[in-house]
């Protein structure tokens, strides 16, 4: 560093835990949503909701920010005819996505709020409420039953009545479907013309019950029971139904595939193709066979359109196809062999001829990169728009491809926005315009573009306040590197202090996630507790996407099948070894952290020996670690380890109990909320039993009655401080030891 640079850096503040929770660092997402060819709705930083017309360059206020504030509303939604707004308030989270809340309707712009309730109850807490696709039609869900309202002011009618609280869910996910299968609490789907509603009926009656304890707030602790299928136990059963909303409500079940491999199945995707045809993906329990069908909503008959099979497991089963207007042509993503690195995810088009039962299938894209999302299909312009990793696995650029002729590809976002390589996007209904959301590496921003020439029309949100805060701080320097293991090039991300010099010795913190198919090394903007470790406490943080990670081909992804932990340990240790070769890393101060599956891995690799058979890690921490996959969710564990009960060797081999007996003097901090509904405290209890048996050193920090996702910001702040303090202390102890050792050496001299 030149002295000038050094001075400017020294004047900059370090990133603190307070910063993580301050308004200065809060990214504002306008949540812009196209509602027509030329208009989108978005929310300003001050809270006002506006409608913007990109052709006339004018905006209209729909809801004043003050109104949202006065209602104490958490969420808002505007009716398709823009006459009414639906607000939710007093919202209570249930699981990751689901919540209950009170709802009110209000005429735009200044109408008085009117409560939304089922006919039989007033002031009811609803599980869901939302507009349909047309006019003012809306549905809401109360006590697992679905109610329909044709327009505001009309009496709601109950259209599905089979619900049973906590047992039979209509139009909503149970725990497993919300967390592992659909990855949303919403399990209902409107037909595009608003005449029909498809909904999932999920039956948990045979699923074993888990009880979450509540220790505080009453003299005797209470429990909250809910159905949670652990590996090998009875799973929820699911059926898909369609009800007609014009006239008497006729309920019709869509018939699952008649296939012996589908004796037990999940429904992973539902998407309307036309107003009478609905696409459904059915996945067998073993998650190695999936069938995509097109179901006739008037008869319930489902026709097979595509089948997928895997020797390992089928990944990315939630993705929705994109249809032509008549539903005869659809684009979907599937894994296609691309040579040595296995399969990569590419766009395939399936076209059916009017008088033929055979569908013509063609690949639109190919190469050793992944299409990560299909965004839109311009039928008139014969173009498909998508995001992909073609640039680099750690990036997401926006591309278009011709859907006729030579399938020519064009990158629309490459070099379009400065300091932006990781994008998401959405297109106006006519595809003439698109909203481009930059997610990094620079401060996130949202811009509006003309599709014809990619030209930026205007900035919708630039988050200038965050840019300013970032410029005033000593932000980490980010570097990328690849490491070579067994014919694989594995990406690594290194965060170094802003004042980094290679003559100083820095502690090393390895942060692991490693959930199969996930990605830790990405060019996304992030300010987290890791940033604080680097900026305020001079640590070097490293992340590595090893075998089992996503976006680098299915060969790499599927390597971990039936042996979770084994190869990830090798790869993460190789990343550490690579870093330890650097002069600037202090090999006596090396730590590891992970949460959830990453907590499993951090616990798994903490005892790992270095090249000289000495311990590599000084300390480690795990937040809500999975410690035994037979205690974890059926859909997750069975996907990677097979069906528990058929062959349990994989389950036995992956237990961390076998590893922790090798823990020596390392400090080990385990953190677990006691009401964790996803990874039960039971995992930590089992682990600690083994640690005690092995006379290992550990500390345990619990969060009484807190759930997995730490919804309270004060608790989150406490959590981050705890983790940071643990590592700072761990690194400081080594400082003391080094000083003592140095003094002893001097005395000997």
């Amino acid at each position: 560093l030149t002295p000038a640079e050094d001075n400017s850096l020294s004047q900059k503040k370090k990133v603190t835990v307070e910063d993580l929770f301050s308004e200065d660092f809060k990214i504002h997402d306008p949540e812009a949503k196209w509602i027509s060819d030329t208009e989108f709705i978005y929310r300003e930083q001050k809270g006002t909701v506006r409608l913007w017309n990109v052709e006339t360059n004018t905006s209209t206020v729909l809801i004043e920010g003050k109104k949202i504030e006065s209602l104490r509303a958490i969420r808002y939604e505007i009716s398709p005819d823009r006459e009414y707004a639906l607000f939710s308030y007093n919202v209570e989270p249930i699981y990751q996505h689901s919540y209950t809340g009170y709802y009110v309707l209000s005429k735009i712009p200044h109408g008085d709020p009117q409560s939304l309730d089922p006919p039989e109850v007033s002031n009811a807490k609803l599980q869901y409420a939302g507009w349909g696709p047309k006019g003012q039609q809306l549905i809401f869900i109360f006590e697992n039953n679905i109610y329909y309202c044709a327009h505001v002011g009309k009496q709601a009618i109950r259209v599905v009545s089979t619900g049973k609280e906590g047992v039979i869910y209509n139009g909503l996910s149970d725990w497993l479907y919300e967390e592992e299968i659909l990855k949303t609490h919403i399990a209902h789907w409107w037909s595009p013309d608003g005449t029909r509603l498809a909904y999932a009926a999920i039956n948990d009656s045979r699923v074993p019950i888990m009880e979450l304890p509540t220790y505080t707030g009453s003299i005797y602790p209470t429990v909250k029971p809910y159905h949670y299928p652990k590996a090998g136990s009875e799973n929820p059963s699911i059926s898909l139904h369609v009800i007609g909303l014009n006239g008497p409500t006729h309920d019709l079940e869509m018939m699952p595939p008649d296939d012996p491999r589908m004796r037990e199945y999940y429904i992973t995707m539902v998407k309307w193709a036309t107003s009478t045809k609905v696409a459904v993906t059915w996945l067998n329990r073993a998650q190695n066979v999936s069938i995509l069908t097109l179901c006739d909503a008037t008869t319930g008959v489902c026709t097979k359109k595509h089948e997928d099979e895997s020797e390992a497991w089928l990944h990315r089963q939630n993705e929705e196809p994109v249809f032509s207007k008549d539903g005869r042509k659809f684009f979907f993503i599937r894994a296609i062999p691309q040579g040595g690195r296995g399969k990569f995810y590419h766009i395939t088009v399936s076209s059916s001829q009017p008088n033929s039962s055979n569908d013509n299938i063609q690949s639109i894209t190919s190469g050793d990169w992944d299409v990560t999302k299909i965004l839109a299909y311009d039928e008139k312009g014969n173009k498909i728009y998508f995001l992909s990793t073609e640039d680099l696995p750690r990036r997401r650029q926006l591309y278009s491809a011709n859907t006729v002729g030579n399938f020519n590809r064009q990158c629309l976002s490459c070099d379009l926005v400065e300091n932006c390589t990781y994008f998401s996007a959405s297109f106006s209904h006519s595809m003439d315009f698109f909203l481009l959301k930059c997610e990094g590496p620079g401060v996130p921003m949202v811009t509006v573009h003309n599709t014809t020439d990619k030209k930026k029309m205007f900035d919708l949100e630039t988050n200038e306040h965050v840019k300013k805060a970032i410029n005033d701080r000593q932000m980490p320097k980010v570097e990328y590197r690849d490491i070579e293991i067994d014919d694989y090039n594995l990406p690594m991300q290194i965060l170094k202090p802003a004042t980094f010099t290679d003559t100083t010795h820095y502690p090393l913190l390895l942060v692991v996630d490693g959930t199969p198919g996930s990605q830790s090394v990405a060019e996304k903007f992030e300010v987290s507790w890791e940033t604080v470790m680097v900026s305020s406490h001079g640590a070097v943080v490293v992340k590595c996407d090893g075998r089992g990670s996503g976006f680098q081909g299915t060969k790499l992804l599927h390597e971990v099948r039936r042996r979770l932990g084994l190869l990830e340990e090798k790869d993460q240790m190789e990343a550490v070894r690579t870093m330890l070769k650097e002069q600037y890393i202090d090999r006596t101060r090396v730590a590891v952290f992970g949460k959830d599956y990453g907590g499993y891995l951090s616990t798994y690799i903490l005892p790992a020996k270095g090249e000289n058979q000495g311990q590599t890690f000084t300390c480690g921490s795990a937040l809500s670690p999975i410690t035994d996959f037979k205690l974890y969710a059926s859909a997750f564990s069975e996907r990677y380890l097979g069906l528990h009960g058929l062959d349990n060797r994989a389950y036995e081999m992956t237990k961390v109990a076998h590893r922790v007996s090798a823990l020596e003097e390392q400090q080990f901090l385990i953190i677990h909320p006691t009401a964790d509904e996803k990874i039960h405290f039971q995992h930590t209890a089992e682990l600690i039993t083994q640690l005690i048996r092995g006379k290992a050193n550990y500390s345990l920090q619990i969060y009484p009655d807190e759930s997995h996702y730490f919804t309270s910001s004060s608790l989150k702040q406490h959590l981050y401080r705890s983790i940071i303090n643990f590592f700072v202390e761990c690194f400081r102890i080594q400082d003391k030891l080094l000083t003592v050792t140095a003094k002893e050496d001097e005395e000997e001299d």
């Epitope: 060819d37 030329t38 208009e39 047309k134 006019g135 209904h429 003439d432």
Partner: nanobody
Framework: QVQLQESGGGSVQAGGSLRLSCAAS????????MAWFRQAPGKERERVAS????????NYADSAKGRFTISQDIAANTVYLQMNSLKLEDTAMYYC???????????????????????WGQGTQVTVSS
């Protein structure tokens, strides 16, 4: 709550005239692609004429050129179809359709199929007799 309401249909002699009206809610009307479609018994619904309410640009199907005129009254949120020199083959149910927030250029060049439109009226019958 009705988004579009047609009126003005009826029976007329060949060679005669009729004026159809389509009243829209302010939302359905503003900056929309408004179109008149017709459907004769046993035939598919076809577009007759369309107008972009933001720009006033109009477009006609070949069968309507020179005989029909689409126009609008912005203050009344109403679109009209003036039909002159009516022929027997003009007998059909006439529907008003709207695509709110339409791109102006797309309205007059691309939007010709029923699935391009979001909102529909109930229809008004036009019968031409000899």
């Amino acid at each position: 709550q009705v988004q579009l309401q047609e009126s003005g249909g009826g029976s007329v002699q060949a060679g005669g005239s009729l004026r159809l009206s389509c009243a829209a809610s302010s939302y359905t009307y503003s900056y929309s692609c408004m179109a008149w479609f017709r459907q004769a018994p046993g035939k598919e619904r076809e577009r007759v004429a369309s107008i972009h309410t933001g720009t006033g640009t109009a477009n006609y199907a070949d069968s309507a050129k020179g005989r029909f005129t689409i126009s609008q009254d912005i203050a009344a949120n109403t679109v009209y179809l003036q039909m002159n020199s009516l022929k027997l083959e003009d007998t059909a149910m006439y529907y008003c359709a709207a695509r709110p927030g339409s791109a102006a250029l797309r309205c007059t060049t691309d939007y010709s199929k029923p699935h391009d439109f979001t909102y529909w009226g109930q229809g008004t019958q036009v019968t031409v007799s000899s």
